[in-house]
Structure formats: structure tokens, C-alpha cells
């Protein structure tokens, strides 16, 4: 039984530095508790952007200081990352873990390349 995770190849952040993408997984079992982690890979460095554990049918709850928000629907998680700047451009990888009930399964997506372009500063108006 394999656990496959799909996510879009490329996403462009909007002018406010917000990027959204869907992380979809093919569940080999009937999970009631799922953990979703977003990892950023840049220059062979990996950092955890955010993580949330949720009960199937309930909302994702990220930590209060998290830059991520999200909603879930079935085996699909809609993720939004806020406050991005040009220096945050990179590969954002979705990791999904079926936490409960056992057995545990894990799947990792191929990553979404998020491009962030800092907005041009507005010219001073006289």
C-alpha cells in the first residue's frame, strides 16, 4: 500500500506575498488523524515552514504565530502561506502523515516551486 502525495509544480505568490496551493494525498487506509507539514528546500537546506495535525472533517489548526493557514476537504488540503518575500522563493514540499489509527503511513510530494516577486515601491506623489 503506497501513500502518494500530489501538489502543483509551480505557484506564483500574489503582490501581497501570499501563495496558495493544494496538497492532495491518496490514502491507503481510513485515517482519522492526519498531520501535514510544509518543508522548504533551498540550496540543499531544509526548514520546516509550518505543521498542523487535524482530525478528518475538522479544520486545520496551525500555531498562532504560523505563516500558514489551511482548510481540509476529504483527502485534500488547501494551504496558504503568507508574508512571503522574494528571498523566500524556493521549493515548498508537502509531507502528509496518517497518524491514527495505526498503521502509520507517510507520503511526500515532489514540491511546489513558489516564486515571490517583491512589489515595486510606489513612487512618491506630490
Amino acid at each position: 500500500k503506497a501513500m502518494h502525495v500530489a501538489q502543483p509544480a509551480v505557484v506564483l505568490a500574489n503582490s501581497r506575498g501570499t501563495a496558495s496551493f493544494v496538497c492532495e494525498y491518496a490514502s491507503p487506509g481510513k485515517a482519522t488523524e492526519v498531520r501535514v507539514t510544509v518543508l522548504r528546500q533551498a540550496d540543499s537546506q531544509v526548514t520546516e515552514v509550518c505543521a498542523a495535525t487535524y482530525m478528518m472533517g475538522n479544520e486545520l489548526t496551525f500555531l498562532d504565530d504560523s505563516i500558514c493557514t489551511g482548510t481540509s476537504s476529504g483527502n485534500q488540503v488547501n494551504l496558504t502561506i503568507q508574508g512571503l518575500r522574494a528571498m523566500d522563493t524556493g521549493l515548498y514540499i508537502c509531507k502528509v502523515e496518517l497518524m491514527y489509527p495505526p498503521p502509520y503511513y507517510m507520503g511526500i510530494g515532489n514540491g511546489t516551486q513558489i516564486y515571490v516577486i517583491d512589489p515595486e515601491p510606489c513612487p512618491d506623489s506630490d
Partner: antibody, heavy 119, light 108 residues
Framework: QVQLVESGGGVVQPGRSLRLSCIAS????????MHWVRQAPGKGLEWVAV????????HYADSVKGRFTISRDNSKNTLYLQMNSLRAEDTAVYYC????????????WGQGTLVTVSS | EIVLTQSPGTLSLSPGERATLSCRAS???????LAWYQQKPGQAPRLLIY???SRATGIPDRFSGSGSGTDFTLTISRLEPEDFAVYYC?????????FGPGTKVDIK
């Protein structure tokens, strides 16, 4: 740097209990699944149990289910293994290991603590 | 439960030679979630490879992993004296996380 230090091993009679501890340092403890892996003398490696992230989810090998309990205290960066109803076949070096960023392989290991179950 | 079988049980080679270790799974290992470890007597295991082919931090490039599905290989291109040890494979795509019985690489 990442460090894992186990303690609590020793000689115990069959049917008795023992509690192992593993103190972690050098990383954000609550962001990782933490595991116990054991190795009987002259034998191979056997995964025992895992306690995930916030501590609420735990999984066990069939060989220890119902007898061993894994727990963690994230405020103390410490992982525990409560071993009850010990048997001779539980004799092994018990390693504390950190799960990896990309999944539950084991990227850092403690030095191990020896548990001997003998009458 | 995924059962892993390693072959050969023992590999007798000389320094400078190439070592090829095999790990076979009883069923497909999800997305190549397979790791390799090295263990020397009296020491804890050390992670060499994860994801079937990604080298862990600080591991020399003479160690390489390959394979997918049910068949995986660890290759040591040129054996150094410090490479003589026992090598284990492990799958981590689903619980219980299982190890192979190990391959001992000893000096011929």
C-alpha cells in the same frame, strides 16, 4: 549539535518493570518523532516504538504491544520507555533515535543502554 | 508488515574493492522510503542513506544507494579500512518500521 543520552538500563528479573529515559539536546524536540530501537546481543536491529511530535500519537511493534509504553515530556526534552512484564527475550541494548525530517528513518542515535532480563 | 531480506549475509573483500549489498522487500516500499545504516562493534548505528539514494550529512561519496519497489542496493565504490562493518537496510513508508537482518562486510 544533536545529542541523545539514554539511561535507566540494568539487570531485572522476568516479570518486573524498568523505565528508560533519553534526554535530547541540540534541536527542537517537539518537531520530531522520537523512537526506541533495540538490539539483542549478537543480533540485528528491531524497531520498538515511536512517540510523535506533541506526544499524543504512539505506535508499537507487536512484540512489545501491551507491555511497553512510550511517552515524552517536551518541556524537558525527554523521551521515556516504560517496560512492564519483562521477558528474557527483551534483553537488548535499547537505543533512543530521532526520526528524520523526510520520514521515520533514524538520523541520530544515542549510545544505547543495556537491559538484561534474567532470574 | 514489510519483511526485508539482505544478501549476502557476509561479504569478504579487500580494501580498495567495490562492495555491492542487496536489500529485498516482501512488498513494494512506498516511494523508495528505504534507509541504510552502518554499525561497528560496540557502537550505535550510523545513518548512511535515506530515500533509497540520498546521502546523509557527512557521508563520503563512495557510498551510494539505488533501487525502487522491492529491490535496493548499497554500493561502496572503494572500500576503506573503516568501512568494514555490518550494514542494515530499513523501510519507513509505513509502520511497523522494519530492518533487514544485516550484511557483514569483513576483510578477506
Amino acid at each position: 549539535q544533536v545529542q541523545l543520552v539514554e539511561s535507566g538500563g540494568g539487570v531485572v528479573q522476568p516479570g518486573r518493570s524498568l523505565r528508560l529515559s533519553c534526554i535530547a539536546s541540540g534541536f527542537t524536540f517537539s518537531s520530531y518523532g522520537m523512537h526506541w530501537v533495540r538490539q539483542a546481543p549478537g543480533k540485528g536491529l528491531e524497531w520498538v516504538a515511536v512517540n510523535w511530535y506533541d506526544g499524543s500519537n504512539k505506535h508499537y511493534a507487536d512484540s512489545v504491544k501491551g507491555r511497553f509504553t512510550i511517552s515524552r515530556d517536551n518541556s524537558k526534552n525527554t523521551l521515556y520507555l516504560q517496560m512492564n512484564s519483562l521477558r528474557a527475550e527483551d534483553t537488548a541494548v535499547y537505543y533512543c533515535a530521532r526520526g528524520g525530517v523526510w520520514g521515520p528513518y533514524f538520523d541520530y542515535w544515542g549510545q544505547g543502554t543495556l537491559v538484561t532480563v534474567s532470574s | 508488515e514489510i519483511v526485508l531480506t539482505q544478501s549476502p549475509g557476509t561479504l569478504s573483500l579487500s580494501p580498495g574493492e567495490r562492495a555491492t549489498l542487496s536489500c529485498r522487500a516482501s512488498q513494494s516500499v512506498s516511494s523508495s522510503y528505504l534507509a541504510w545504516y552502518q554499525q561497528k562493534p560496540g557502537q550505535a548505528p550510523r545513518l548512511l542513506i535515506y530515500g533509497a539514494s540520498s546521502r546523509a550529512t557527512g557521508i563520503p561519496d563512495r557510498f551510494s544507494g539505488s533501487g525502487s519497489g522491492t529491490d535496493f542496493t548499497l554500493t561502496i565504490s572503494r572500500l576503506e579500512p573503516e568501512d568494514f562493518a555490518v550494514y542494515y537496510c530499513q523501510q519507513y513508508g509505513s509502520s511497523p518500521f522494519t530492518f533487514g537482518p544485516g550484511t557483514k562486510v569483513d576483510i578477506k
